[in-house]
């Protein structure tokens, strides 16, 4: 159904191979990514309320697919920390993040509630709640497949257990 307006391969925005997304746009994609669909010549990325497509061979497309596969994007994505308290001189931010069972959070409202209720993470990454408006959009459609929603995913229940220690001094957050 490639090209179909109603099918999983409909594109809201097509990114040309000649002009890959900027770093800022990639960060936005990482943060809001909910799913991807492999189409014939391109991949469609489903975000909270819109979609974007790119050529299957484009490096940024491969990177985003890998990111979602490894659960490093989307719901679980915490974003780069710009400013954070409790920093040790040579250590990265105290993450306090922990992962729990994959609770099947079916609605954006529940996702927001889950995030707000998480008192285990006093040092939230900057911008981690910047998508509140998107999370509660009334026109957001949650597509259910095999008992899971796009709003949830592997380890969607993270940050709901006890706090954890973060990595030691060798895990650096400086820009590469």
């Amino acid at each position: 159904n490639e090209g179909s307006v109603t099918g999983s391969c409909y594109c809201g925005k097509r990114i040309s191979s000649d002009s890959p997304p900027s770093v800022q746009f990639m960060n936005r994609l990482r943060k809001h990514l909910r799913a991807y669909h492999r189409c014939l010549y391109y991949t469609r990325f489903q975000l909270l309320s819109w979609s974007v497509c790119g050529g299957n061979k484009d490096p940024w497309v491969q990177e985003l697919m890998s990111c979602l596969d490894l659960k490093e994007c989307g719901h679980a994505y915490s974003g780069i920390v710009a400013h954070q308290k409790h920093l040790l001189p040579t250590s990265p931010p105290i993450s306090q993040a922990s992962e729990g069972a994959s609770s099947d959070i079916h609605t954006p409202a529940q996702m927001l509630l889950s995030t707000l209720q998480s008192t285990q993470r006093p040092t939230l990454p900057v911008g981690s709640l910047s998508s509140d408006k998107e999370l509660t959009r009334p026109n957001e459609t949650t597509i259910h497949t095999a008992g899971h929603s796009l709003a949830a995913g592997p380890e969607a229940g993270e940050n709901q257990k006890q706090p954890e220690k973060n990595a030691g001094p060798t895990a650096r957050t400086s820009a590469t």
Partner: antibody
Framework: EVQLVESGGGLVQPGGSLKLSCAAS????????MNWVRQASGKGLEWVAR??????????FYADSVKGRFTFSRDDSKNTAYLQMNSLKTEDTAMYYC?????????WGQGTLVTVSS | DIQMTQSPSSLSASVGDRVTITCKSS????????????LAWYQQKPGQSPKLLIY???TRQSGVPDRFSGSGSGTDFTLTISSLQAEDFATYYC?????????FGGGTKVEIK
């Protein structure tokens, strides 16, 4: 060729410390989610710890049995992961495997043996 | 935590036999975000580290003979060895990587009949 080489294992007394290292090559280390898994002699496999990638602030997660005693870290510039193990107990005796989870599969090292005994 | 139940715990078979090992998870391992099942199968021989055979439930790892195949979705998975070879006698584990903590099946020891 993907390679994960663990080192740092050995014999240590209860209450002692060890630091395991995992040197990686053959794949993009910075994009991999790293884990440690252990296996006591004749037993099954037990997950120990996980560390996420830089975009997720290198967040770490631990099995309940090691929480507060073990610390997982990574240095992407050196393609190396570390497991600092403190307050070791006899039940921590096992072969420790470093694993790299990538979209192309889960790679394992050959392991390093940790023996905690008095 | 997701529980992984593997069966049988051991089996005896002969070279050339078709062997089937099953693994059941306590919750679905299928992620709607990419339609992938977060399940892997390993082979382990005494004194060696686990060797990845199958990931994403059905994708054969590079270099693994095609007599090994994985199938299933959601909560029920199967590893099939179509024609058992002498070098296949080992212990096999399933593993879910859908959620932290990663959890493993108890293992299936494939022995020579």
């Amino acid at each position: 060729e993907v390679q994960l080489v663990e080192s740092g294992g050995g014999l240590v007394q209860p209450g002692g410390s060890l630091k395991l290292s995992c040197a990686a090559s053959g794949f993009t280390f910075s994009n991999a989610v790293m884990n440690w898994v252990r296996q006591a002699s004749g037993k099954g496999l037990e997950w120990v710890a996980r560390i996420r990638t830089k975009p997720n602030n290198y967040a770490t997660f631990y099995a309940d049995s090691v929480k507060g005693r073990f610390t997982f870290s990574r240095d992407d510039s050196k393609n190396t992961a570390y497991l600092q193990m403190n307050s070791l107990k006899t039940e921590d005796t096992a072969m420790y495997y470093c694993t790299a989870w990538t979209t192309e599969g889960i790679y394992w090292g050959q392991g390093t043996l940790v023996t905690v005994s008095s | 935590d997701i529980q992984m139940t593997q069966s049988p715990s051991s089996l005896s078979a002969s070279v050339g036999d078709r062997v089937t090992i099953t693994c059941k998870s306590s919750q679905s391992l299928l992620y709607s975000g990419n339609q992938k099942n977060y399940l892997a199968w390993y082979q382990q021989k005494p004194g060696q580290s686990p060797k990845l055979l199958i990931y994403w439930a059905s994708t054969r790892q590079s270099g693994v003979p095609d007599r090994f195949s994985g199938s299933g979705s959601g909560t029920d998975f199967t590893l099939t060895i179509s024609s058992l070879q002498a070098e296949d006698f080992a212990t096999y584990y399933c593993q879910q990587y859908y959620d932290t903590p990663w959890t493993f099946g108890g293992g299936t020891k494939v022995e020579i009949k």
